[in-house]
């Protein structure tokens, strides 16, 4: 029996009850917050093999081990995880060891076994045998080993019974608790799973099985489950379901679960049967069970019930995230904010369509419009008194509305009204009349041309960089001395630099009034040699890199209430030449016979330009002594060499520290300060355990029902 | 496999309340779907009772709305009916079921309730 | 209420002939998203009532292809292409676009 789509059992033991004919558990298992202590004996779950999602323990008094209660769980999936983790076991009071005897494989997702005082056996189990990659297991705060003793059956009758692998250096047995061996295939299966007498399994089947190579003696599949068989895909007229089995289409369309209660009903896309159209698709009809590829951003459309939007904070702009067509009025006023001109950008960005008008107002932290950087089409469909549907009125830093070279924005309906934007020069917005369509609709005062502008250099001259010359982190640039009617008036060159992988940035790139500003600025004075051209080293970058570089002239913005000239450069596009690059990462060596060497490695992080070859050296070297010191034949443990990694597990520490051997000499000495980068790790450390806590708080803490 | 189990007095007197319970396997009532209860008196047609929703929410045919309530128990997946003041009329094969998006894809084997003094 | 109407109320039938059964509704059913949430159920004697039409066409996995429905905003009809003795029973239109859901009175079809 599949039981779903989730089992949350709380409070009372007795709910236990509910698992009694699961077979699979389509969805996760939460036992949690049982308080009083029970007695779990009389409950057991045999026929559960399976949980396609996570299993979840937290603070169930009285439980002492999971093997009673699911002597046959072989396999947790997860497809879904607990914040990434597919087996949780967290402040398990009573719980001695997790003796799920039977489990064999975690197909996603790692574990977290984490406050439990009493828990032991962790150390015996050999999670690789389970989990693809242990590297992202947390095991921490549990009952420390050396108060454990744990023994793996038969230990102490020297007739050990289980298995031995090797984990960080320890080759050892290998058990769940003082009865239970982990359960390990012969290596002739390879990936296969094997059955109690060690046959291999079907190819197909994951886990155990209950035959050897039988496709429906499957304890669970490897790929999906249909009809009884497992099977690599699901077959023509059924779709993949929950990452684990095959349904068919009629199954599909009457889903209706509490998670998808607000969509249209599951789709079919790609052979799978799934909540929603995956990101770059869209439904082929309001009520379609199929998905089409979105042609650019998918479609998103947002109402307001208010039917005007006011964006004052970021908060504000974040209720936008993703709407491609706003239904309604924008009405943006940002007074301040920190990065705002980048955080506008990442929630308003794709906004396509306002089907009624924008207002900008009072917003002195813009200098820029160009965050609306999707935005195509103003309906106007409503309207300000007066008929206009875009208004700008009293923003005392904005200086571009948008990049007109690269952009096409059509206002369908109304006027434009520009007022008391000192920076905004008249000839911007004249080219915001061409571009949308609204010349000739504007009266004469609805562009006032005396206070829009008036602290601007507006009647900008090009700058024309006369030199260029790069080395590996530096670049020199000078350019043509500008000359204004009136020498005085020229005060200084600002040089605005920054990297730029491609050839499409724009002088208002994440540029606020606030401060904020994606360009690197440096100020060159004038050369006090009037036929010297000024110039400028930028140092301290990267190699092999392009980066963007503009200059500007700074001058005098008033000259006698008249507007003067202003001047600055095209933005040119430069890359730092290549340079040596940094080492390989990751090289690994393993010999595969007595005549050769398999080397591997990663790329360098830093390549610093196009990477055209590796040279690889060797050498031979003398044979280590130490190998010929044991007797290999033996019967006692082979020693292991254990290399100090100058960390200390501070859970692990309970005898005075000061034993350690320092700087060579025999005798006590306290322990090394810790280094600046430990202190880090330690503090990320806490804050990924509070991260954690209160995922787990705000996910199980959930209102009583009726 | 979703199974569900009608249970109850199958004999009510006239003017009490007739009470049901559907349990649940396989499928958690809280999960999704809506939970159904529908009638048949003997020889006669099908007729649809109310729903109670996996949100809790529930609906009712307006004609039974002032006799009738459908309620969960979440700890033991169940839902039940009641029927209060019940005459010969009400005598029929109570079914629960359960119902998607679309159809009712699982149904209970039925009860029969009969209404005598 | 929506009213289903069904009609032959009782259907004698021979094997390997075909069978047609109407369902006409008192207001369109179509649902306010566009969809026609109308089933087809059989139920055979001593048994609770199996789907077989769903959403006006759409036959459920599983069933022959025998079976076969049609009609649109408030006529409706079930089609047996060729009437075999294992779909003797009674047959049961059924409306849910609107609250208070509602059956058709049913259709009883049986071999001659």
């Known amino acids: 029996e599949i039981c779903g789509p989730g089992i949350d059992i709380r409070n009372d033991y007795q709910q236990l009850k509910r698992l009694e004919n699961c077979t699979v558990i389509e969805g996760y298992l939460h036992i949690l917050l049982i308080s009083k202590a029970e007695d779990y004996r009389s409950y057991r779950f045999p026929k559960l093999t399976v949980i396609t999602e996570y299993l979840l323990l937290f603070r169930v008094a009285g439980l002492e081990s999971l093997g009673d209660l699911f002597p046959n769980l072989t396999v947790i999936r997860g497809w879904k995880l607990f914040y990434n983790y597919a087996l949780v076991i967290f402040e398990m009071t009573n719980l001695k060891d997790i003796g799920l005897y039977n489990l064999r494989n975690i197909t996603r997702g790692a574990i977290r076994i984490e406050k439990n005082a009493d828990l032991c056996y962790l150390s015996t189990v050999d999670w690789s045998l389970i989990l693809d990659a242990v590297s992202n297991n947390y095991i921490v705060g549990n009952k420390p080993p050396k108060e454990c003793g744990d023994l793996c059956p038969g230990t102490m009758e020297e007739k050990p019974m289980c298995e031995k692998t090797t984990i960080n250096n320890e080759y050892n047995y290998r058990c769940w608790t003082t009865n239970r061996c982990q359960k390990m295939c012969p290596s002739t299966c390879g990936k296969r799973a094997c059955t109690e007498n060690n046959e291999c399994c079907h190819p197909e089947c994951l886990g155990s099985c209950s035959a050897p190579d039988n496709d429906t003696a499957c304890v669970a599949c490897r790929h999906y489950y249909y009809a009884g068989v497992c099977v690599p895909a699901c077959p023509p007229n059924t779709y993949r379901f929950e990452g684990w089995r095959c349904v068919d289409r009629d199954f599909c369309a009457n889903i209706l679960s509490a998670e998808s209660s607000d969509s249209e009903g599951f789709v079919i896309h790609d052979g799978e049967c799934m909540q929603e159209c995956p990101s770059g698709f869209i439904r082929n009809g309001s009520q379609s069970m199929y998905c089409i590829p979105c042609e650019g951003p998918c479609p998103k459309v947002c109402e307001e019930e208010k039917k005007t939007k006011t964006i004052d904070s970021v908060t504000s702009a974040q209720m936008l995230q993703g709407c491609t067509i706003f239904k309604g009025n924008l009405l943006i006023n940002i007074r301040r904010g920190n990065n705002i001109a980048s955080e506008l950008e990442n929630f308003m960005g794709l906004i396509e369509v306002v089907t009624g008008y924008v207002k900008i107002r009072h917003s002195h932290a813009l200098v820029s419009l160009s965050f609306l950087k999707n935005l195509r089409l103003i309906l106007g469909e409503e309207q300000l008194e007066g008929n206009y549907s875009f208004y700008v009125l009293d923003n005392q830093n904005l200086q571009q509305l948008w990049d007109w070279d690269h952009r096409n924005l059509t206002i369908k309906a109304g006027k434009m009204y520009f007022a008391f934007n000192p920076k905004l020069c008249v000839s911007e917005i004249y080219r915001m009349e061409e571009v949308t369509g609204t010349k000739g609709r504007q009266s004469k005062g609805d562009i006032n041309t005396r206070n829009n502008g008036e602290r601007a250099s507006c009647e900008s001259d090009v700058l024309h960089f006369t030199s260029t010359t790069t080395s590996k982190n530096r670049i020199i640039i000078t350019w043509h001395r500008y000359r204004p009617p009136d020498y005085r008036d020229l005060i200084s060159f600002t040089v605005y630099y920054k990297e730029a992988p491609f050839k499409n940035v724009t002088e208002y790139d994440g540029q606020d009034a606030c401060g904020s500003n994606s360009w690197n600025m440096v100020d060159v004075d004038l050369p006090p040699n009037k036929d010297v051209e000024p110039g400028i080293l930028l140092h301290g970058l990267k190699p092999w890199t392009q980066y963007a570089v503009y200059v500007k002239a700074v001058t005098l913005t008033m000259v006698e209430n008249d507007h003067i000239r202003g001047a600055k450069s095209e933005i040119l596009y430069i890359r730092t030449n290549a340079s040596v690059p940094s080492i390989p990462l990751d090289v690994l060596s393993a010999s595969n016979s007595s005549s050769q060497l398999i080397v591997k490695w990663n790329p360098p992080s830093l390549p610093n330009g196009n990477l055209s070859y590796y040279i690889v050296r060797w050498q031979r070297q003398p044979q280590d002594g130490y190998l010929y010191r044991h007797n290999y034949c033996s019967k006692d443990k082979i020693p292991i060499r254990k290399y100090a990694d100058g960390t200390i597990d501070i859970e692990e520490v309970t005898e005075n520290p000061k034993t350690e051997v320092c700087g060579g000499e025999k005798g006590p000495c306290c322990a090394c300060p810790k280094t600046e980068a430990e202190k880090q790790a330690e503090k990320e450390e806490a804050e990924y355990r509070k991260v954690f806590e209160n995922f787990l708080h705000n996910s199980i803490f959930v209102p009583r029902p009726e | 496999q979703v199974q569900l189990q009608e249970s109850g007095p199958g004999l009510v007197k006239p003017s009490e309340t007739l009470s049901l319970t559907c349990t649940v396997s396989?499928?958690?009532?809280?999960?999704?779907?809506?939970w159904n209860w529908i009638r048949q008196p003997p020889g006669k047609g099908l007729e649809w009772i109310g729903y109670?929703?996996?949100?809790?929410?529930?609906n009712y045919k307006p004609s039974l709305k002032d006799r009738v309530t459908i309620s969960r128990d979440t700890s033991k997946n169940q839902f039940s009916l009641k029927l209060s003041s019940v005459t010969a009329a009400d005598t029929a094969v109570y079914y629960c079921?359960?119902?998607?998006?679309?159809?009712?894809?699982?149904w209970g084997q039925g009860t029969l309730v009969t209404v005598s003094s | 209420d929506i009213v289903m109407t069904q009609s032959p109320l009782s259907l004698p039938v021979t094997p390997g002939e075909p069978a047609s059964i109407s369902c006409r509704s008192s207001?369109?059913?179509?649902?306010?998203?566009?969809?026609?949430?109308l089933q087809w159920y059989l139920q055979k004697p001593g048994q609770s009532p199996q789907l077989l039409i769903y959403?006006?066409?759409n036959r459920l996995y599983g069933v022959p292809d025998r079976f076969s429905g049609s009609g649109s905003g408030t006529d409706f009809t079930l089609k047996i292409s060729r009437v075999e003795a294992e779909d003797v029973g009674v047959y049961y239109c059924?409306?849910?676009?609107?609250?208070?859901?509602?059956f058709g009175q049913g259709t009883k079809v049986e071999i001659k």
């Open positions: 059924f409306q849910g676009s609107h609250v208070p859901w509602t």
């Open positions: 207001q369109s059913i179509v649902h306010s998203n566009g969809n026609t949430y």
């Open positions: 079921a359960r119902y998607g998006r679309v159809f009712f894809d699982y």
């Open positions: 959403k006006v066409s």
């Open positions: 396989g499928y958690s009532i809280t999960g999704g779907y809506l």
């Open positions: 109670h929703s996996y949100d809790g929410t529930n």
